[in-house]
Amino acid sequence: AVNGTSQFTCFYNSRANISCVWSQDGALQDTSCQVHAWPDRRRWNQTCELLPVSQASWACNLILGAPDSQKLTTVDIVTLRVLCREGVRWRVMAIQDFKPFENLRLMAPISLQVVHVETHRCNISWEISQASHYFERHLEFEARTLSPGHTWEEAPLLTLKQKQEWICLETLTPDTQYEFQVRVKPLQGEFTTWSPWSQPLAFRTKPAALGKDT
């Protein structure tokens, strides 16, 4: 590894996973690097191997336990290090004191399904995955619908400012194919960010009844 602009960013999924990305301009692609987690008040340590995701960035997931186990709390601080092998020794490239509940990014919502569909409306539900019970109802969602001839980036964002795991889409066009995505974010955390978008759910509105105005 060589000197250059370096960035080390990690997020906690609120249960048992810390995902990290390390980028370093000019670092060698074949360098063996890992992230090491050292909590301040727990007996375990954890390591993951950084794998290349682009020319100058690497990523890995620290698996802290079973997916739904609550491995960290709001008072925990985890010292995270990037270590790279240089010859026979490991060298620390980056370090941070990570406050998990200040750096949250939840898993993408799952189990999207059409509850009810009509000509102009569609009711969709979903579930959140591996989200801490600490949040209670302090979550918000964003949703978007892909219309024919448009891109996801053009889709207007619908904001749900509460823990509401369903939406009723209205003013849809009859007999039309749509796709729908949703993402989630806790209200807590200075550096908290949106989850990835869910897998898209495809649905089709019902055709208008023959002989009726649409």
Epitope: S6, F8, W38, L83, R91, V92, A94, I95, Q96
Partner: nanobody
Framework: QVQLVESGGGLVQAGGSLRLSCAAS????????MGWFRQAPGKEREFVAA????????TYGDSVKGRFTISTNNAKTTVYLQMNSLKPDDTAVYSC???????????????????WGQGTQVTVSS
């Protein structure tokens, strides 16, 4: 490579003060953090204090908090350790260390530091 040379150690009575200096030379542009560790006979090396090269952040080991102060000169080439209210337990070889790791922690470890000085002996008599 970075070269570190410590000075200022010596014999002092309990309750007294000493000021250690560590001069860095070589590839110091790569350094982000300077620190002090100490090792008493028969004991593991212990973290004492660290300071960011910018001087904006400093942290201390529990056993020296409130008594020791770490600082740097304007050129960021020398780091100082002002040691007040010294106790016999502070007797050790004090080593300066330098780290190129990007970022900051309050929990520095020996693994974080790439370059080390030879050390200077501090003896506190009762």
């Amino acid at each position: 490579q970075v070269q570190l040379v410590e000075s200022g150690g010596g014999l002092v009575q309990a309750g007294g003060s000493l000021r250690l200096s560590c001069a860095a030379s070589g590839s110091i542009f790569s350094l982000n953090t300077m620190g002090w560790f100490r090792q008493a006979p028969g004991k593991e090396r212990e973290f004492v204090a660290a300071i960011s090269r910018s001087g904006g952040s400093a942290t201390y080991g529990d056993s020296v908090k409130g008594r020791f102060t770490i600082s740097t000169n304007n050129a960021k080439t020398t780091v100082y350790l002002q040691m007040n209210s010294l106790k016999p337990d502070d007797t050790a070889v004090y080593s300066c260390a330098a780290s190129a790791a990007v970022g900051w922690t309050t929990r520095w470890s020996t693994i974080d530091f790439d370059s080390w000085g030879q050390g200077t002996q501090v003896t506190v008599s009762s």
